[in-house]
Structures are given as structure tokens and as C-alpha cells.
């Protein structure tokens, strides 16, 4: 509402200019290419980077100069395409070149790739990262970005400004340090863990708004909203919902300057009027702006307000439930999302969207009986299996990890995902399961309260990126069918699958599980790897294999790769031992 | 009897201005928040202006600049200056009552709904 209405503009180029400063503008210019065309090198982003900062300048002197009028879809459109041999390098993508605005961007977009056949982004040794940090550390940033970026074509952008903030203030602690690598490699692990995370999360976002809309979205953000801000009344709630919503739809349409501005507006309105929306915000007002927006993104849950009536009082009990339904559908269910999500923030948002769901089904269904009030009057105990089926989850998944530890329980999904969808490659499954089994080591060391909306959040964001991928490559009919639901219903669907039955097992293949000794030399993540795959690989071979069956082969496997790495002479150790590792683990699975 | 009632409606030439008025009654006022909905034919109801029980001001970006909500709490009454009308704001007006705090009381409250045509 309002935060982001101002005057019309003359150049929009000039204003964002104006608005973000040079060094956010060029940043964001180059995240924004990078999404968009992801097999240019850094060094051709960078030249056009340079040319559209350039021309800004141009504009910001004189906003009546020639072209300052346009619209940054056209001036970025036209950069794009004016790049050569694009046809060569990016086949039919070239052919949104033909498009006019709005469509061209909107081709633009639909040929992002989730998955872009990049090589893993590698980090150089500490030595030479610090090297090319101290000759020139904005170019050294700017890869940073174009890495990221080109690899991760949804990621929030002013986020990543904020990561690459992160990054700039850790080299210049830890390149100033005698044991460089010892500073550097714990701190870059967290912040490209967290920003893994956060990629994850925010395609999530992208996801609900391009297949469910604006409204999907707002709804997700009152949840939210309402939850880390119990106190901030619904009209505040609603506001801050709209704004939101508006800042994401614009990052996922790739409108990252208007989206960064937006944000730092959002903050700025935010921290103006801590009073009517939260106690906690002090300390995030506080910082620089790409800290502040961070900090405001991620704060701690307000308190509850001690005198909340129990819902039923308003949503259940009062007579007047199915006029107040009839009269604004949208509106009252907001409000009924809005007081139930500010009194369970032990709750996932996908959660209280499926409570909200539901009760707008019970609604639609009793306002038209004769009684009304007889019917919905037990809804509230109809939500009780919907909050038990996901506590169950937290706990059992907790449990198992606990007890297996993150790579033991990485691999007891492994087994679980691949007996649900064999067809789904193997590569796809091993990222999945990874990442899936990550939630144990981020979600099952917090609080109680906090477990259920960590873990279910978290593990709706990485499913969605297995239907992102799947749709490239439709295999599975059980993963089609949890995917084509509705976003909040996909975790239980994919939690409730069961061993495909329609799967014929993968005939054995006995240079699937043949190894040689350069697997000793792997990083640990990299050996794990080899041996999830292997894993996957038994699963889709004996996809009704018991937990026993597998621990037996994995253990073997295991005590194989440990001998032979230890051996004098790996190469023959690999290549004697191994034959007879692969007829133990087919005896093992007969 | 609990009721709103809205007033002030009319056909009004683009360019010109016209003041809403929300009377309300059998409530207690200053434990609501007042806002106004508009629905046109065939659309959702959406939000055009609210004003919390402090006073605090939230308007729809469409209406930004244009229009202003006030409350008189002694005359248990909100308002809405509409000026610059467009075409575009012609709809029916809803008037609306939301309680924010744990008195007794309706929690969700409508008024009938006042016609306002913007045409030349």
C-alpha cells in the first residue's frame, strides 16, 4: 500500500540510478544479466555492465537525453540481445529476440535453467584468493556475483549483495591472518551453506507466485507476517503482506532494480514504525542497509500478546461466521489466517495455509446446510490429524538422526526416496537426499517450538526444486502426481508415498560398483558421494532390499574402500578386491 | 442493534470529490479498527483505506494521494475524502468494523454498501 508509489519518473535508468548508488546498481546489473544469459563468461557481463552504467550516468545528467525514457526491460532486453553469436550459444533462447516488451522478458525468463550444466563452483586455495582479492577486490566480488548468480538464476538479488558483503568482509579479516586458509574455509562454509539455503527458499517463492499467483503469495506472507509479528494489528499485517508481495514478484520477473529499491523501502518503512509492528526490531534498525534487510528478514518472533482469545470464539462460535464468509470470502479468511498464525508460531507456514484450507473447504460446505453452525462447529477438531501428521514427522525424522548422525540419516532418505521414485536419475536422487538430510543438523538442534517450522519449511523448499528438476525430465508418475498438487500439499504427498510398485528393478551392472584407487584422494564430500550413488544404484536394483540387506552391503563397501585406500598398492588392491566386493554385495541382495 | 451505516454516495464527474461518512452503532468504537472496501462488478472485494484504533493510516496504492480516512471517536463515525476521482474508482463502497481487542463485540462488521458512479 503506498510505501512505493512515487512520482512518475522521467528515466527509470536515472531514478534506480539515483535510488541504489553505483555499486549496488552495477552489482545488481550484473546479477541480473547472469540469470538471464548463464554461459557468458564474467568478462562479457561485465563489458555490458559497464555500458548500461555508463549510460545511466548519461541519464542521470540529463534525463531528456536520448533513450532515457526507456524501460529497463527494453534498454536490458537490447543489451541481450545485441550480444553476438547468441543463436550459437543459446539455441532458441536468441528467438526471444524477435519478441517485443512485455513478451520478450517474459521469454526471457521462461528459458532460465534450475539447472545449468556449469561445473561445480570450485574455491581457489586461500593463497591465491587472497591474492586476487588484494589486486582488485571488485573484480574479484563481481565473479562472486556471476558465479552465483549464473548458477542460481532465481536468487534473491539484493540477498545476494548481501552475501557478497559477507564474502568481501571475511577475505579482508581472514587475508590479513597468517594461517589464511585455517580463517577463511570455516567462515565461507557458513555463508555458502546459508546462501544455499536461501537460493532454495527464495525459488520456493518464485515458484508459488509463477504457478499459483499473487494471491498464493500474500497468503504465505500473512503466515509469515503474522507469526514473527503477533502484535502488529491485521491492517499493518495486510500492508506489510502487499509490499512483500510486491518486492518478490518483481525479483522473480527480474526486475532487480525496482525489487532492491522496494526492499530498502520495505526496511526503511519497517524501522519507522517499530512501534505498531514489533519490540524486536531495534537491533536490525540499527545496521546498514543490506545488514538491516537481512536482519529484518530473518528476525526473532515478537511476544505473543498474553490475552488472545481462543479462536473459536470468533471463527467458530460467533452466529455471524457464515455472513462474515459470504460478505468478503478473502477478506475473512485473511483475518482467520492472521489470528491463527500470530497464536502458533510453533507452526510451519505450510501448515497453517493447509488449517486455512481447510477451513475455508469446511465453510464452503456447512454455510449452505440448513444448520450451519452444527456443521462447522467441529472443525477446529478436524484440523488435529493435519498438526499430527507433521509433528510425527519431526519427531521420527529427529529420532533417526540422532541416531545416525547427518551422512547416516542423508542415507536412510536416500533409500526411502529412491524406493518411492526409481525412475528419477541418480544424481537427482543423491542431491535431493543430501539435501533433504541437512535438516537434521539445521532444524533438530533447535528448541522444540522452533523444530516443526524449521524442518517442514525447509523440506517443502527442497522438494520443490526436485519438481522443478523432474518437470525438465517427467520420469515418475508418484512425483508428477506430489508435484502438480497444490505448493502446501506436496511435503505430505511425497511423505506418503510408498515402494513403487510399477518399477521394473535395474538389471545388475557390475561397472556401476566397480571402483578405482582415485576415489582415495576425493574430499570427504566428494567420497560420500561416490558411495550415495552406489547406494541409490543397489536401491534401484533391489528396490524391496531390507534396511538390513543395505547396511551389510554399505558396511562391506565401506571396509572395502578403507582397506584398499590404506593398501601399499591401491591399484591392485582395487582391482582384486573389487570383483569380490561386487559378488558379495549380489549374494548379499539375492 | 450492532450496525454501520454508510452514506454519502453518488455519481460525480472525473476530477471531483466526494466524502463518505460510516456511522456506527451498538458497538464499542475505539475498540475497532474502520476501513473501507469497494468491490466492482464481477471483482473481488479489495481494501481502499483503513485507520487503526490509534489513528494509524493504510490506503491502497491505486488511491494513494487521493483519497484520505479520518475517525471521530466522540461521534462513533469514519470518513472517507475522496478527491481527483477516476472512472476506475466506481464501485460499491463497504464500510467495515474489525475488533482488535479481547472485549466482546462482533470481530468482523459490514455496512450495506454505499453506490459511487464516476462517469462524464
Known amino acids: 500500500r503506498g510505501v512505493f508509489r512515487r512520482e512518475a519518473h522521467k528515466s527509470e535508468i536515472a531514478h534506480r540510478y539515483n535510488d541504489l548508488g553505483e555499486q549496488h546498481f552495477k552489482g545488481l546489473v550484473l546479477i541480473a544479466f547472469s540469470q538471464y544469459l548463464q554461459k557468458c563468461s564474467y568478462d562479457e557481463h561485465a563489458k555490458l555492465v559497464q555500458e548500461v552504467t555508463d549510460f545511466a550516468k548519461t541519464c542521470v545528467a540529463d534525463e531528456s537525453a536520448a533513450n532515457c525514457d526507456k524501460s529497463l526491460h527494453t534498454l536490458f532486453g537490447d543489451k541481450l540481445c545485441a550480444i553476438p553469436n547468441l543463436r550459437e550459444n543459446y539455441g532458441e533462447l536468441a528467438d526471444c529476440c524477435t519478441k517485443q516488451e512485455p513478451e520478450r522478458n517474459e521469454c526471457f525468463l521462461q528459458h532460465k535453467d534450475d539447472n545449468p550444466s556449469l561445473p561445480p563452483f570450485e574455491r581457489p586455495e586461500a593463497e591465491a584468493m587472497c591474492t586476487s582479492f588484494k589486486e582488485n577486490p571488485t573484480t574479484f566480488m563481481g565473479h562472486y556475483l556471476h558465479e552465483v548468480a549464473r548458477r542460481h538464476p532465481y536468487f534473491y538479488a539484493p540477498e545476494l549483495l548481501y552475501y557478497a558483503e559477507q564474502y568481501n568482509e571475511i577475505l579482508t579479516q581472514c587475508c590479513a591472518e597468517a594461517d589464511k586458509e585455517s580463517c577463511l574455509t570455516p567462515k565461507l562454509d557458513g555463508v555458502k551453506e546459508k546462501a544455499l539455503v536461501s537460493s532454495v527458499r527464495q525459488r520456493m517463492k518464485c515458484s508459488s507466485m509463477q504457478k499459483f499467483g499473487e494471491r498464493a503469495f500474500k497468503a504465505w506472507a500473512v503466515a509469515r507476517l503474522s507469526q514473527t509479528f503477533p502484535n502488529a494489528d491485521f491492517a499493518e499485517i495486510t500492508k506489510l503482506a502487499t509490499d512483500l508481495t510486491k518486492v518478490n514478484k518483481e525479483c522473480c520477473h527480474g526486475d532487480l532494480l525496482e525489487c532492491a529499491d522496494d526492499r530498502a523501502e520495505l526496511a526503511k518503512y519497517m524501522c519507522e514504525n517499530q512501534a505498531t509492528i514489533s519490540s524486536k526490531l531495534q537491533t536490525c534498525c540499527d545496521k546498514p542497509l543490506l545488514k538491516k534487510a537481512h536482519c529484518l528478514s530473518e528476525v526473532e518472533h515478537d511476544t505473543m500478546p498474553a490475552d488472545l482469545p481462543a479462536i473459536a470464539a470468533d471463527f467458530v462460535e460467533d452466529q455471524e461466521v457464515c455472513k462474515n464468509y459470504a460478505e468478503a470470502k478473502d477478506v475473512f479468511l485473511g483475518t482467520f489466517l492472521y489470528e491463527y498464525s500470530r497464536r502458533h508460531p510453533d507452526y510451519s507456514v505450510s501448515l497453517l495455509l493447509r488449517l486455512a484450507k481447510k477451513y475455508e473447504a469446511t465453510l464452503e460446505k456447512c454455510c449452505a446446510e440448513a444448520n450451519p453452525p452444527a456443521c462447522y462447529g467441529t472443525v477446529l477438531a478436524e484440523f488435529q490429524p493435519l498438526v499430527e501428521e507433521p509433528k510425527n514427522l519431526v519427531k521420527t525424522n529427529c529420532d533417526l538422526y540422532e541416531k545416525l548422525g547427518e551422512y547416516g540419516f542423508q542415507n536412510a532418505i536416500l533409500v526411502r526416496y529412491t524406493q518411492k521414485a526409481p525412475q528419477v536419475s541418480t544424481p537427482t536422487l543423491v542431491e535431493a537426499a543430501r539435501n533433504l538430510g541437512r535438516v537434521g543438523t539445521k532444524c533438530c538442534t533447535l528448541p522444540e517450538d522452533q523444530r516443526l517450522p524449521c524442518v517442514e519449511d525447509y523440506l517443502s523448499a527442497i522438494l520443490n526444486r526436485v519438481c522443478l528438476l523432474h518437470e525438465k525430465t517427467p520420469v515418475s508418475e508418484h512425483v508428477t502426481k506430489c508435484c502438480s498438487g497444490s505448493l502446501v500439499e506436496r511435503r505430505p504427498c511425497f511423505s506418503a508415498l510408498t515402494v513403487d510398485e510399477t518399477y521394473v528393478p535395474k538389471e545388475f551392472k557390475a561397472e556401476t560398483f566397480t571402483f578405482h584407487s582415485d576415489i582415495c584422494t576425493l574430499p570427504e564430500k566428494e567420497k560420500q558421494i561416490k558411495k550415495q550413488t552406489a547406494l541409490a544404484e543397489l536401491v534401484k536394483h533391489k528396490p524391496k532390499a531390507t534396511a538390513e540387506q543395505l547396511k551389510t552391503v554399505m558396511d562391506d563397501f565401506a571396509q572395502f574402500l578403507d582397506t584398499c585406500c590404506k593398501a601399499a598398492d591401491k591399484d591392485t588392491c582395487f582391482s582384486t578386491e573389487g570383483p569380490n566386493l561386487v559378488t558379495r554385495c549380489k549374494d548379499a541382495l539375492a | 442493534e450492532v450496525q454501520l451505516e454508510e452514506s454519502g454516495g453518488g455519481l460525480v464527474q472525473p476530477g471531483g470529490s466526494l466524502r463518505l461518512s460510516c456511522a456506527a452503532s451498538?458497538?464499542?468504537?475505539?475498540?475497532?479498527?474502520m476501513g473501507w472496501y469497494r468491490q466492482a462488478p464481477g471483482k473481488e472485494r479489495d481494501m481502499v483505506a483503513t485507520i487503526s484504533i490509534g489513528g494509524r493510516t493504510y490506503y491502497a496504492d491505486s488511491v494513494k494521494g487521493r483519497f484520505t480516512i479520518s475517525r471521530d471517536n466522540a461521534k462513533n463515525t469514519v470518513y472517507l475524502q475522496m478527491n481527483s476521482l477516476k472512472p476506475e474508482d466506481t464501485a460499491i463502497y463497504y464500510c467495515?468494523?474489525?475488533?482488535?481487542?479481547?472485549?466482546?463485540?462482533?470481530?468482523?462488521?459490514w455496512g450495506q454498501g454505499t453506490q459511487v458512479t464516476v462517469s462524464s
Open positions: 467495515v468494523a474489525h475488533r482488535q481487542t479481547v472485549v466482546r463485540g462482533p470481530y468482523l462488521l
Open positions: 451498538g458497538l464499542t468504537f475505539n475498540d475497532y479498527a
